[in-house]
Amino acid sequence: TTELTEEKYEYKEGQTLEVKCDYALEKYANSRKAWQKMEGKMPKILAKTERPSENSHPVQVGRITLEDYPDHGLLQVRMTNLQVEDSGLYQCVIYQHPKESHVLFNPICLVVTKGSSGTPGSSENSTQNVYRTPSTTAKALGPRYTSPRTVTQAPPESTVVVSTPGSEINLTNVTDIIRVPVFN
């Protein structure tokens, strides 16, 4: 039995949340990935990658950037200029169909509070598009992009999840992924 417990991150307004989500290379390298926020029982898709995924081509939706590295089985998520209202529960998912998705790794509980973050959030943007090629035994990343594409997407899609998030999420009988059934 695998128990998925939420992982807590506390930030000040203006800071940047960055998380890395692993996925099984052989299963999901060519799948679309998404970043979603749980709103009550409704997960809302905030941003999703294109298909097929391309190395080093970020998808940006507002303050959210998704960067998929299918050669590494890694999705990087970045939310800049965090605001108090961003607080909530987030998940990386494999977006295989609007009516079903697979949750990757543990949910992220984001708590954003007011106060000085040390460095204004806007100054962080200067580093958003600077990536170093990783040292890895997996295939090397393709050429670094020169001008990131901004992908305009439709409004967030809502789906219905069967579990209700509380202060802690416990999803049992899970191996690598959790199937989230959706009802229309």
């Epitope: 695998t2 992982e7 949340l17 998380v19 099984a24 089985g73 890694l74 990087q76 790794f105 580093t127």
Partner: antibody, heavy 119, light 108 residues
């Protein structure tokens, strides 16, 4: 309770090999990225290698690239570090560490195993 | 690689006093910074991650702040068990993950 227990350290001559093991319990090993971090006597911490969870991707510090190999056996809940062509400067306590959440920081550490490379 | 520089190398503080430790990154790591405490003969212990989030079980007297390249760990009122070596570590983007050289907090 999360536990990590390293073994396999010892004394070896330069050019020799050692295989470190880290047996873990208390969490779903296959889901988490794991790292090896070392600390030379009286010195600071140095990250050595990482193996991601679901993807199995591996990463190495430049100082060990081509000489060390990280691997894992999810059925045995064990992380390994195969160290070849050892050098005197590889002498250190080697810790295995569980990575927190999906980011490469370390919330649980083993007690460490000492590797001494000396002629 | 990103170089992490800690200051001071040694900090002499009396019990009950406030301790302020600094960590500087050679380039922005946003909020991808952690602080660890290490006592002699022991493995490091995670104190702070995400620059300001306290790890499970860490007392409220430990606080972290900063973003970008400048970070601070503050111990508001030093207890006897807080005398140790403290390391910062960046986990921004891709490996290698790098640590600062450490700050030793000793009894004054």
């Amino acid at each position: 309770e999360v536990q990590l227990l390293e073994s396999g350290g010892g004394m070896v001559q330069p050019g020799g090999s050692l295989r470190l093991s880290c047996a873990v319990s208390g969490f779903t090993f296959s889901r988490y990225a794991m790292s090896w971090v070392r600390q030379a006597p009286g010195k600071g911490l140095e990250w050595v290698s990482e193996m991601r969870g679901s993807s199995g991707s591996t990463y190495y510090a430049d100082s060990v690239k081509g000489r060390f190999t990280i691997s894992r056996d999810n059925s045995k809940n064990t992380l390994y570090l195969q160290m070849n062509s050892l050098r005197v400067e590889d002498t250190a306590i080697y810790y295995c560490a569980k990575e927190f959440s999906s980011n490469s920081l370390f919330d649980y550490w083993g007690q460490g195993t000492l590797v001494t490379v000396s002629s | 690689e990103i170089v992490m520089t800690q200051s001071p190398a040694t900090l002499s503080v009396s019990p009950g006093e406030r301790a302020t430790l600094s960590c500087r990154a050679s380039q922005s790591v946003n909020s991808n910074l952690a602080w660890y405490q290490q006592k002699p003969g022991r493995a490091p212990r995670l104190l702070i991650y995400g620059a300001s989030t306290r790890a499970t079980g860490i007392p409220a007297r430990f606080s972290g702040s900063g973003s970008g390249t400048e970070f601070t760990l503050t111990i508001s009122s030093l207890q006897s068990e807080d005398f140790a070596v403290y390391y910062c570590q960046q986990f921004y983007n891709w490996p290698p993950w790098t640590f600062g050289q450490g700050t030793k907090v000793e009894i004054k």
